[in-house]
């Protein structure tokens, strides 16, 4: 893959090692941790990004939210197993042979078990709700301006087509961005909503994954939109399977 023309870097992923060893001396970039080649014209998969990030692992914790099937990933850092396409493998295990099943965004969707645990398929997260609270402003943002700006941001920065931004809700100071994407809806080259949400989450936290690009500067009609807190809810095509004990 070509990365940046002049200096061999990956614009969309700073957690890469790049060298001009591709065909014809082209710049080729590989993700840290996995060594997998990445396409620097688009987002790197969340699985490869988590793998690259993992030097000091934390325990993954996942909560079921009020919507009975919604999952929240409380910054669940772990060293994931990724398939050859960079997607999460359905079953993840840690060094102590504790295993669990994950969805397509890498969030645990079953109780933890041992090596005998079976995860038949990678269940797709088809609906992501990004819940933001912005800092106080002189007045409320205009809803349609906010909607347009967020759609533009997701297209230009994260390459997500606006068709996948199902809705933008706003009740000052809460903004909710709904991303929806069924497997069948994804056409060639379309970014995965899980990857877009992860990049956005890291941007909001001031931990941009982009190389050399400034941090996220969100403005609506020139007015800065500064986010105080973020919660991301994940809804899977098949509801998660947790024991009743965990739900009480």
């Amino acid at each position: 893959h070509t990365a940046a023309q002049d200096n061999c870097t990956c614009p969309t992923n700073k957690m890469t090692v790049c060298s001009p060893d591709g065909p014809g001396g082209r710049c080729q970039c590989r993700a840290l941790g996995s060594g997998m080649a990445v396409d620097c014209s688009t987002l790197t998969s969340k699985c490869l990004l988590l793998k690259a990030r993992m030097s000091a692992p934390k325990n993954a914790r996942t909560l079921v939210r009020p919507s009975e099937h919604a999952l929240v990933d409380n910054d669940g850092l772990y060293d994931p197993d990724c398939d050859p396409e960079g997607r999460f493998k359905a079953r993840q295990c840690n060094q102590t042979s504790v295993c669990w099943c994950v969805n397509s965004v890498g969030v645990r969707r079953t109780d933890k078990g041992d090596l005998s645990l079976r995860c038949d398929e990678l269940v797709r997260t088809h609906h992501i709700l990004i819940d933001l609270r912005h800092r106080p402003t002189a007045g409320a943002f205009n809803h349609s301006d906010l909607d347009a700006e967020l759609r533009r941001l997701f297209r230009e920065r994260y390459r997500l087509h606006p068709k996948f931004v199902a809705a933008v809700h706003y009740e000052q100071p809460t903004i909710q961005i709904e991303l929806r994407q069924n497997t069948s809806q994804k056409a060639a080259g379309d970014v995965d909503i899980g990857d877009a949400a992860y990049y956005f989450e890291r941007d909001i936290k001031g931990e941009s994954l982009f190389q050399g690009r400034g941090g996220l500067d969100l403005r609506v009609r020139g007015e800065p939109l500064q986010v105080e807190r973020t919660l991301i809810y994940y809804l899977d095509e098949i509801p998660p399977k947790f024991s009743m004990k965990r739900l009480t």
């Epitope: 070509t2 023309q5 614009p11 014209s41 688009t42 759609r151 533009r152 297209r155 230009e156 390459r159 087509h161 606006p162 068709k163 069924n182 069948s184 809806q185 994804k186 056409a187 060639a188 080259g189 379309d190 970014v191």
Partner: antibody, heavy 119, light 108 residues
């Protein structure tokens, strides 16, 4: 091999509608975006709209909104572009083109359909 | 909408010449710039996508460069079959996706 075959040339009167078809073969029709682009005689290329055949999502250039409708028939792997309220300045060659979701590059094009609007 | 401006609008060159066509976007489009070749009576043909990536089957004498707002298409050594009209197109932002007005490359 990938092919996009369009319907034949049309002559229409002002105020009428035209429906151009584009039959895809050689790839999975529902796995790619389909776009429509037109070119007036001796002029440049003008993007009109797009569709994802998998879910029938469409979006159109503001200039054509209300006049253009893009549809598809997945059973025959065919996309359609209908333009209504035709005027003389709609005389052009209309192309369908397969698109990539990230680059929005058009890697395969139909042969084009000349639509002439004349009274 | 993003405006794409090509220059020159036409140019004359000879077989073997090195030719450069430029395309300027009215705002930053990162690297989401594609180039097409069109011959009279034919549909456009994709040459280069994402600024510099050569489409499969396109000769290596074609190359692209640039970033942000300024882009170039270079033909290192013109061949007789290269005389055609060339269009740039941006795929960066929300629709509509816009094209340059075209550059006609003629035989000197």
């Amino acid at each position: 091999q990938v092919q996009l075959v369009q319907s034949g040339a049309e002559v229409k009167k002002p105020g009428a509608s035209v429906k151009v078809s584009c039959k895809a073969s050689g790839y999975t029709f529902t796995s790619y975006w389909m776009h429509w682009v037109r070119q007036a005689p001796g002029q440049g290329l003008e993007w009109m709209g797009e569709i994802t055949p998998s879910d029938n999502y469409t979006s159109y250039a503001q200039k054509f909104k209300g006049r253009v409708t893009i549809t598809r028939d997945t059973s025959t792997s065919t996309a359609y572009m209908e333009l209504s309220s035709l005027r003389s300045e709609d005389t052009a060659v209309y192309y369908c083109a397969r698109g990539h979701g990230n680059y929005v590059s058009f890697d395969y094009w139909g042969q084009g359909t000349l639509v002439t609007v004349s009274s | 909408d993003i405006q794409m401006t090509q220059s020159p609008s036409s140019l004359s060159a000879s077989v073997g010449d090195r030719v450069t066509i430029t395309c300027r976007a009215s705002q930053d489009i990162s690297n989401y710039l594609n180039w097409y070749q069109q011959k009279p009576g034919k549909a456009p043909k994709l040459l280069i996508y994402y600024t510099s990536r050569l489409e499969s089957g396109v000769p290596s004498r074609f190359s692209g460069s640039g970033s942000g707002t300024d882009f170039t298409l270079t033909i290192s050594s013109l061949q007789p079959e290269d005389f055609a009209t060339y269009f740039c197109q941006q795929g960066y932002t929300l629709p509509p996706y816009t094209f340059g007005q075209g550059t006609k490359l003629e035989i000197k």
